[in-house]
């Protein structure tokens, strides 16, 4: 691979062969020694005779105890300070020192960017000991570089607690245009000007940009990176991209698509869920919102009867959900319903119309005239009334329900008696003696339970007290019935 | 086959609350009211009180002040709470069921012996 | 309030013997009246109801009688497990109250 070095001082050498320090063209390793540890940094062995020394970071030695002689301050031989490479390619550079044998237990570690490499990096450690001092070279290859891979790369050895630093590898790796910031896919108001960003970045720089609507440039002159591209309105929907170049070449952007707002299609499939006397529950499926959210949507209700005016009702509700529950409908009444939206644009078109029938409501009226008496001889009490006059709507009377509560001694207890549509009496069991019992009836159809009557209280003396007097419903202005025995 | 199964502190000290629970199994809660009764030692029986299953309450006038009875019907359990306990509050404490028009109790839990003592 | 009164408190008999068990009320108690039996350490068990009607699984030699304010319970003959507390309990005012007992125990 041909790699680029930029430096400002060639490094000194100090073996044969490959230098320490040096750029490398090639991807052997430097020196196949039996002392080598890939992966780790790796210990100290034997001497070897120093090389020149480097004045930057350095460690001062104390005096030895054998010869009282003054060892040479320790530091990183210079090496290759800049590496440029295109993407994809591999790489190998390395750092040498050369440390007295007195020395032990020496690391060497490799960082980037202030943060310690660890782990399985393919760093290797080579050792070239002599007789008194070692030289280390430190080699640190990558195979198939990135952009991830630039930075600023530097060895670091620990002396008796005091650390050297190498001079810093500048690793520069150069492709294509990379893009920081594309064109995003846009929904704009026909006519209406908008703003396109596109961003690329090197190395290697200057990147400058192209912008391509529907396969033709829009620019002739390129713009440095970043771009904005105003577009002052579009009637129809358009495809945009942009180009960025350098000296390695282009890449293109994705292509994205601004949309032009326009109204909603009308909803679809408008269907009934449940209808009750006076409700019906319906849902559609929305139809194409026309590039801008769905705000809200109408639902219209016509009632279908030769008889009425053929006014709309109109309910507004939310868009979502896709559901909506109509009220306050006639009973037992047949209905035409349908469905229209709005965007920020405008409302749809209706929805196709449909049917839908409200069912037979629940008696409007209670039972007339509820007279009450006890039957004491077989501890009954007596219930009689009349049929209400209901509406046609409230569909076929099924029977009634009576309620009696029955309170004592400050207990109380309601029970419930269902009766034919046959019948305008009953008999129901004393529950309690000594006790008043009130009693209320409502008239029921397939369609509900209507209200109940005024209550009409009966009290039921001790057992033995007889007394036949009955209760009846009050005529109109009186509130609460009480029989006094 | 329905059943109920009461429990609940057996040893107070007097001025705590007395709390039992029953629970029925196997049978519907609905449309029967259920009641709490207790038998002091070597005595006769006294209803304390009932709840229907749609929480509607009704006491004994002679402990309504003391009594609380409550119902849990997504466990099918109902619960007494008798506050302000004394030595007379001693007793085995039944929970029954009854039918809600006719107040016979044809159900009964095993009884809970409570005590009251200093 | 309905008082119920038991007589007589205890009650000594042989099995095969006749037993018979009366509850005076203080007011009149229509029939709203039933019977229970409870046996050492065991809940009440529902013998009759409304004064006359025997409760599901109750043997036939258990009858009830009366109306108003005086009532019976009788058992034909006695077997050994019928040896126990016999309550009186009445429904027809609120609240509702129990007698205090009849023991019936084995000669």
């Known amino acids: 691979a041909i790699t680029e070095a930029r430096e400002e001082a060639k490094p000194y050498p100090l073996f044969p062969g490959p230098l320490p320090g040096s750029l490398q063209t090639d991807h052997t390793s430097l020196l196949s020694l039996p002392h080598t540890s890939g992966y780790q940094p790796a210990l100290m062995f034997s001497p070897t005779q120093p090389g020149r020394p480097y004045t930057g970071n350095v460690a001062i030695p104390r005096v030895t105890s054998a010869g009282s002689k003054l060892l040479p301050p320790l530091a990183f031989k210079h090496t290759v300070g800049h590496i440029i490479l295109s993407e994809h390619k591999d790489v190998k550079f390395n750092c040498s020192i050369s440390v007295p044998n007195i020395y032990q237990d020496t690391t060497i570690s490799w960082w980037k960017d202030g943060k310690e490499l660890l782990g399985a990096h393919h760093a290797i450690t080579q050792f070239y000991p002599d007789d008194e001092v070692t030289a280390i070279i430190a080699s640190f290859s990558i195979t198939s570089v990135q952009r991830s891979d630039n930075g600023s790369y530097i060895c670091k050895m620990k002396i008796n607690n005091e650390e050297i630093v190498s001079d810093p590898i500048y690793i520069e790796v150069q492709g294509l245009p990379h893009f920081t910031k594309q064109p995003e896919s846009m929904n704009v108001t026909r006519n209406t000007a908008f703003n396109l960003t596109c961003q690329a970045v090197g190395p290697p720089e200057p990147v400058n940009i192209f912008w391509v609507q529907n396969s033709s440039r829009v620019n002739e002159q390129p713009e440095k990176s970043p771009s904005v591209l105003t577009v002052p309105g579009l009637t129809e929907m358009a495809v945009f991209s942009c180009e960025a170049h350098n000296d390695k070449g282009l890449t293109v952007s994705k292509g994205v698509q601004i949309n032009i707002k326009a109204i909603p299609s009308p909803p679809t499939e408008v269907s009934i869920h449940n209808s009750t006397a006076h409700s019906i529950l319906i849902s559609w499926v929305p139809g194409f919102d026309g590039y801008s959210p769905f705000r809200n949507c109408s639902v219209q209700v016509k009632e279908v009867d030769p008889l009425s005016n053929g006014s709309v009702m109109i309910f507004n509700t939310s868009a979502s959900p896709h559901m909506y529950q109509i009220k306050q409908l006639q009973a037992l009444a047949n209905y035409s319903i349908g469905v229209s939206c709005m965007n920020e644009i405008g409302w749809s078109a209706v929805s196709p119309w449909i049917l839908a029938s409200t069912t037979e409501g629940a008696p409007s009226v209670a039972p007339l005239n509820v007279t009450v008496f006890l039957n004491e001889s077989r501890d009954n009490v007596d219930i009689r009334w009349m049929k209400p006059l209901t509406k046609r709507q409230a569909g076929e009377l099924v029977g009634y329900r009576i309620s009696h509560v029955w309170q004592s001694a400050g207990i109380s207890k309601e029970l419930l008696e269902e009766v034919g549509q046959n019948n305008s009496r009953a008999q129901i069991s004393v529950q309690v003696h000594n006790a008043t019992c009130t009693v209320r009836i409502a008239a029921v159809t397939k369609g509900g339970v209507g209200p109940f009557s005024d209550p009409v209280k009966i009290f039921i003396p001790a057992h033995g007290w007889v007394d036949h007097a009955p209760s009846s419903t009050p005529a109109p202005g009186n509130a609460d019935p009480v029989l006094i025995i | 086959q329905v059943q109920l199964q009461q429990w609940g502190a057996g040893l107070l000290k007097p001025s705590e609350t007395l709390s039992l629970t029953c629970a029925v199994y196997?049978?519907?809660?609905?449309?029967?009211?259920w009641s709490w009764l207790r038998q002091p030692p070597g005595k006769g029986l006294e209803w304390i009180g009932e709840i229907s299953h749609s929480g509607s309450t009704n006491y004994n006038p002679s402990l309504k002040s003391r009594v609380t009875i409550s119902v849990d019907t997504s466990k099918n359990q109902f619960s007494l709470k008798l506050s302000s306990v004394t030595a007379a509050d001693t007793a085995v404490y039944y929970c029954?069921?009854?039918?809600?028009?006719?107040?016979?109790?044809?159900?009964w839990g095993r009884g809970t012996l409570v005590t009251v003592s200093s | 309030e309905i008082v119920l009164t038991q007589s007589p408190a205890t009650l000594s008999l042989s099995p095969g013997e006749r037993a018979t068990l009366s509850c005076r009320a203080s007011q009149s108690a229509s029939n709203y009246l039933a019977w229970y039996q409870q046996k050492p350490g065991q809940a009440p068990r529902l013998l009759i109801y409304?004064?006359?009607n025997r409760a599901t699984g109750i043997p036939a030699r258990f009858s009830g009688s009366g109306s108003g304010t005086d009532f019976t319970l009788t058992i034909s003959s006695l077997e050994p497990e019928d040896f126990a507390v016999y309550y009186c309990y009445q429904r027809s005012q609120w609240p509702i109250s129990f007698g205090q007992g009849t023991r019936l125990e084995i000669k």
């Open positions: 029954a069921r009854a039918l809600s028009r006719y107040w016979y109790f044809d159900l």
């Open positions: 409304d004064a006359s």
């Open positions: 196997g049978g519907s809660f609905s449309g029967y009211y």
